[in-house]
């Protein structure tokens, strides 16, 4: 199979085509399928785009959508690292206000221990 190594979208691919980009990635990279209209092409990324996290699987690592409520970026399926605007990050989850005993740090939008 032609690997089209010169094509930048084939970077990190184990298998690549000029029409669909990567279809398999090198071991430590994450597969991401970019959809544009009715076309799609695969990419192999060192880190996943915002809103996705790196999911490791035996067949192929892939980027998976962050589905934590009101979360913008996450480290894993269950752990948010950045909340949507107007929400505060506390122990991997997003809250519209910090729990009792925690105060909001406005610069980072995180809840920290201490009185309000």
């Amino acid at each position: 199979r032609a690997s089209y190594v010169s094509n930048p979208i084939c970077k990190g691919c184990l298998s690549c085509s000029k029409d669909n980009g990567c279809s398999r990635c090198q071991q430590k990279l994450f597969f991401f399928l970019r959809r544009e209209g009715m076309r799609q092409y695969g990419e192999c990324l060192h880190s996943c785009p915002s809103g996705y996290y790196g999911h490791r699987a035996p067949d192929m690592n892939r980027c998976a959508r962050c589905r934590i409520e009101n979360c913008d970026s996450c480290f894993s399926k269950d752990f948010c690292t950045k909340c949507k605007v107007g929400f505060y990050l506390h122990r991997g989850r997003c809250f519209d206000e910090c729990p009792d005993g925690f105060a909001p740090l406005e610069e980072t939008m995180e809840c920290v221990e201490g009185c309000e």
């Epitope: 298998s15 085509s17 669909n20 990567c22 279809s23 398999r24 597969f31 991401f32 399928l33 970019r34 959809r35 009715m38 076309r39 799609q40 695969g42 996705y52 999911h55 699987a57 035996p58 067949d59 192929m60 892939r62 980027c63 998976a64 959508r65 589905r67």
Partner: antibody, heavy 125, light 107 residues
Framework: EVQLVESGGGLVKPGGSLRLSCAAS????????MSWVRQAPGKGLEWVSS???????YYPDSVKGRFTISRDNAKNSLYLQMNSLRAEDTAVYYC???????????????????WGQGTTVTVSS | DIVMTQSHKFMSTSVGDRVSITCKAS??????VAWYQQKPGQSPKLLIY???TRHTGVPDRFTNSGSGTDYTLTISSVQAEDLALYYC?????????FGGGTKLEIK
């Protein structure tokens, strides 16, 4: 618990129209893509249409221009308007969650993770 | 369109046996394959997506292996309740397409 309940099937003459509905519950309907899949008597599964959470619609060539998928997020409902019906459209029509062709998810929403019980459409003169 | 081929329309097995159902895509689908189970008189149920991830509540006797164009659903120890039709589907590019189905019969 995710529930999808289809309705609106029935007997219709070739060239006629029918509107199918799917009532969804047990999840945040507006956040998910939704799809219709059909199964002709004694046959396999065939994708009919999908609609993204944002309202973008997708169809295979076999129904393009005849079928229209739509959603009403306020009513947690999915619809399929079927016009110019043909004998080959006879099938059980299933409503399913997921299957958005416009967005990559990398998870269960790329497949169709929950299905309704189906509604039967018969096109015959 | 991507054609999904399930070469066996029927497979006969006994309770406790290991059975493998195969599916071949007409082009590389990058592990974007789902498997569905349809029991008689019921609607399909998702078993596996992205080639290897089991859906919520699916017993661990169901596994899938494969990459590129070839995928295999394996039931490690068949139970009587596994009597059903099994469909593969590619969720790589539209139109979404399904295999013709494999009917698992219990001896």
């Amino acid at each position: 618990e995710v529930q999808l309940v289809e309705s609106g099937g029935g007997l219709v003459k070739p060239g006629g129209s029918l509107r199918l509905s799917c009532a969804a519950s047990g999840f945040t309907f507006s956040s998910y893509a939704m799809s219709w899949v059909r199964q002709a008597p004694g046959k396999g599964l065939e994708w009919v249409s999908s609609i993204s959470s944002g309202g973008s619609t997708y169809y295979p060539d076999s129904v393009k221009g005849r079928f229209t998928i739509s959603r009403d997020n306020a009513k947690n409902s999915l619809y399929l308007q079927m016009n110019s019906l043909r004998a080959e459209d006879t099938a059980v029509y299933y409503c399913a969650r997921g299957g958005d062709p416009g967005v990559y998810n990398g998870d269960y929403e790329d497949a169709m993770d929950y299905w309704g019980q189906g509604t039967t459409v018969t096109v015959s003169s | 369109d991507i054609v999904m081929t399930q070469s066996h329309k029927f497979m006969s097995t006994s309770v406790g046996d290991r059975v493998s159902i195969t599916c071949k895509a007409s082009q590389d689908v990058s592990s974007a394959v789902a498997w569905y189970q349809q029991k008689p008189g019921q609607s399909p149920k998702l078993l596996i997506y992205w080639a290897s991830t089991r859906h919520t509540g699916v017993p661990d006797r169901f596994t899938n292996s494969g990459s590129g164009t070839d995928y295999t659903l394996t039931i490690s120890s068949v139970q009587a309740e596994d009597l059903a039709l099994y469909y593969c589907q590619q969720h790589y590019s539209t139109p979404w397409t399904f295999g013709g189905g494999t009917k698992l019969e219990i001896k």
